[in-house]
């Protein structure tokens, strides 16, 4: 006869491990008992369980309530056991010793490997600002046994670097993603991908990039200078910029306060029916936590085109 077993049994933390030990013998042979032991390089061989043809399963104190026989139907020649709720401390070498009649004793050893799936965490780096050099965008850490693989999935151009720390029963892997911040990266996903034999599928954690910037300001509304004439209604100037965080807008007049009736609504300056008093230099101020910008335009309101006695003004922008 011979023992059918497995050199390596792999199980995920918390699952039940089946330690196989099946005696394949002649029809007239009987298995008297199967003694299971934990083989420890420091402590030697320690009793784990005894499967006896007469009194069934007896389990050693340290494994009480954790060792069972596989569910029926059971073959009398099957000495396999179930180790419930495998923990990291269970990882190691096990031995089954089968006493048969009349063939004698047989023994086999196997290794139990307990996979500890990682629980990854992603930590964003310091705030990203346009104009910085190579900067840490995010780091991703995963600890498991064996060591997990940590990579990045993104369309953003950057560099990744990994380092690992070995603990007594596991390893922690940290991967960092560095980039040169630019406004085009804003809102782009940066995904940490963790692979491990104990995971059914890769774990993914996505971080959305935020790059602080403030674009140059410009003013729209003076494209057709002939529209800026006395009496015109609904004339507006709009300040154009963009930024992250979104900027705040403010309007001032360079040569004095804003004329009465002129209203500021966010990025837009709204005029009442135009008069020549609305002529002047207007300044749009744009700011966010990162920076501030300004753009100025000169408004010249033309005399009423139906009154030929009035001089025609020109409109210019700077």
């Amino acid at each position: 006869g011979e023992l059918e077993t497995s050199d390596l049994v792999t199980v995920v933390l918390g699952q039940d491990a089946k330690l196989p030990c099946f005696y394949r013998g002649d029809p007239d042979e009987q298995v008297g008992q199967v003694a299971w032991a934990r083989v420890d390089p420091n402590e030697g061989t320690r009793e784990l369980a005894l499967l006896h043809s007469k009194y069934g399963l007896h389990v050693s104190p340290a494994y009480e309530d954790r060792v069972e026989q596989p569910p029926p139907p059971r073959d009398p020649l099957d000495g396999s056991i179930l180790l419930r709720n495998a923990v990291q401390a269970d990882e190691g070498e096990y031995e089954c010793r089968v006493s048969t009649f009349p063939a004698g004793s047989f023994q086999a050893r196997m290794r139990l490997r307990v996979l500890v799936p990682p629980l990854p965490s992603l930590n964003p780096g310091p705030p990203l600002e346009e104009g910085q050099g190579l900067t840490l965008a995010a780091s991703c850490t995963a600890e498991g046994s064996p060591a997990p693989s940590v990579t990045w999935d993104t369309e953003v151009k950057g560099t990744q670097s990994s380092r690992s720390f070995k603990h007594s029963r596991s390893a922690a892997v940290t991967s960092e993603f560095h980039l040169v911040p630019s406004r085009s990266m804003n809102g782009q996903p940066l995904t940490c991908v963790v692979s491990h034999p104990g995971l059914l599928q890769d774990q993914r954690i996505t971080h959305t990039l935020q790059v602080a910037f403030l674009a140059e300001a410009s003013v729209r509304g003076l494209e057709d200078q002939n529209l800026w004439h006395v009496g015109r209604e609904g004339a507006t100037l709009k300040c154009l910029s963009e930024g992250q965080p979104p900027p705040k807008y403010n309007w001032t007049r360079l040569d004095g306060p804003l004329p009465s009736g002129v209203r500021v609504k966010g990025d837009t300056l709204g005029f009442p029916p135009l008069t020549t008093e609305h002529s002047g230099v207007y300044v749009c101020h744009v700011s966010n936590e990162l920076s501030s910008r300004a753009s100025q335009v000169t408004v010249e309101v033309l005399a009423d085109p139906e009154d030929p006695g009035k001089q025609v003004d020109l409109v210019s922008a700077s």
């Epitope: 069934g56 050693s60 104190p61």
Partner: antibody, heavy 118, light 109 residues
Framework: QVQLVQSGAEVKKPGASVKVSCKAS????????MHWVRQAPGQGLEWMGI????????TYAQKFQGRVTMTRDTSTSTVYMELSSLRSEDTAVYYC???????????WGQGTLVTVSS | SYVLTQPPSVSVAPGQTARITCGGN??????VHWYQQKPGQAPVLVVY???DRPSGIPERFSGSNSGNTATLTISRVEAGDEADYYC???????????FGGGTKLTVLG
Amino acid sequence: QVQLVQSGAEVKKPGASVKVSCKASGYTFTGYYMHWVRQAPGQGLEWMGIINPSGGSTTYAQKFQGRVTMTRDTSTSTVYMELSSLRSEDTAVYYCARGRLGTYFDYWGQGTLVTVSS
Amino acid sequence: SYVLTQPPSVSVAPGQTARITCGGNNIGSKSVHWYQQKPGQAPVLVVYDDSDRPSGIPERFSGSNSGNTATLTISRVEAGDEADYYCQVWDRSSDQVVFGGGTKLTVLG
């Protein structure tokens, strides 16, 4: 080598309690069950119960249910057996014994004589 | 509860074979263990699991178990074998350990 060393002899009055200790050495304390067996003068062996030194769980013989308490201290590798409401019939030598899988006893303590007398 | 029955005493001459029986209902389906106890001493395991011997126990001690009787056999008996002998089983149904009443082995002469 494996050793089980028990506490010394005790004399108790009826109705009192006695607590006997058994200190284990020479092996992994939490790796083996510990049993208590008593023997009255000129009588046979009588099983009292079992304790799991690892988890602390116990099983007591039906005869002693409610009167016996078995505990353990893993820091000192010691098990204890306390018997309450003592009567003269409890006069006996009390043994701790290391249990093997299959429930037999491969090592025994030297025994502790408990005398119950008014 | 399960009961084990032993003869109170067995006498045998030195060099002869002593047989100590342990009776119990269908005891052959259980594993039987045997202990030797000398006066004033703790018991010593001499046979376990029907017929296995712990290290240090002479080959003269052997055991068998079938039907309703388990037997401890001591061949070539010596004066030093004089002692009380106890059989023991674990009763699966009640989860209790059961001892026989003990047998006093007397070595004649």
